[in-house]
């Protein structure tokens, strides 16, 4: 069976600088040439779009300039990085993959990556 399934890690811990990275991998049947990747955040039963990018296979993944996401693509694998995260951004981040071309359109949704963000403790003043 070559039906598309989206795989992503269950849990990721953001760095002290508020950066979280994870891989979104999709088993794509056929050879899609245009793929859209969207990151959704689910918290308190509400789903919001974090960022989205469309890319042509073989080209680089490009998010909007003001996006908090960056990423690279390699075959059926997308390496996603989300920046500027704070403790209040802790939640389930879902990778949505759409095969836009050639038809027919196809949608795959991952189970989500729980990203934990811990705000760093403020540094105490040093007295030398």
């Amino acid at each position: 069976c070559k039906a598309m399934h989206v795989a992503q890690p269950a849990v990721v811990l953001a760095s002290s600088r508020g950066i979280a990275s994870f891989v979104c991998e999709y088993a794509s049947p056929g050879k899609a040439t245009e793929v859209r990747v969207t990151v959704l955040r689910q918290a308190d039963s509400q789903v919001t779009e974090v960022c989205a990018a469309t890319y042509m296979m073989g080209n680089e993944l490009t998010f909007l300039d003001d996006s908090i996401c960056t990423g690279t693509s390699s075959g059926n694998q997308v390496n996603l990085t989300i920046q500027g995260l704070r403790a209040m951004d802790t939640g389930l981040y879902i990778c949505k993959v759409e095969l836009m071309y050639p038809p027919p359109y196809y949608l795959g949704i991952g189970n989500g990556t729980q990203i934990y963000v811990i705000d760093p403790e403020p540094c105490p003043d040093s007295d030398f």
Epitope: A3, K31, R36, M56, Y101, P103, P104, Y106
Partner: antibody, heavy 114, light 108 residues
Amino acid sequence: EVQLVQSGGGLVQPGRSLRLSCRGSNFNFDDLAISWVRQAPGKGLEWLGFVRSKAYGETTDYVASVKGRFTISRDDSKFIAWLQMDSLKTDDTAVYYCTTFNYWGQGTLVTVSS
Amino acid sequence: LPVLTQPPSVSVAPGKTARISCGGNNIASEAVHWYQKKPGQAPVLVIYYDSDRPSGIPERFSGSNSGNTATLRISRVDAGDEADYYCQVWDRTTDQPVFGGGTKLTVL
């Protein structure tokens, strides 16, 4: 409910022109290529051509048998696509469908006869 | 263009399983889609990407693809399944879709 609603069609004389319309609703129309497929009486499905999405510059491709006679275009602001058929022949008689392959219009009969 | 070969007709008794084949050179390397076409109605996508069912399509419809043959299976066939069935792939060389010739399914 996702819909592709077609209009146009009917009886036309050989050598004349006809334009079919296809209006989409309740799906990401502007993201998807819109194809036209026909079925002549007693025959199978035949893909005629398509207009790709804006991501591809709304470029078009056609099957050899209609290239130069048929033109496909779209206006995403109106969620509509067209099939302009010129220099029609009797063997263009068929039911014509617009489609994204996930979704299909209801079909419209074009009869080319003198 | 790749050539997709389907049997012109398949007959099956009610309640049995219908199998409709779609042959093509190394078709397993392609994504195969299946459409149901009833007289006077628009085609309906019943299986896409070899084996997935769009929403609203009964579980009785399934698909597989290996070697040089893709297969559409319809289990517990009933009279409402009588239709023409078409396989389709996307030809990457020409960037165009290709349909099989279609198979008329008759429920005895």
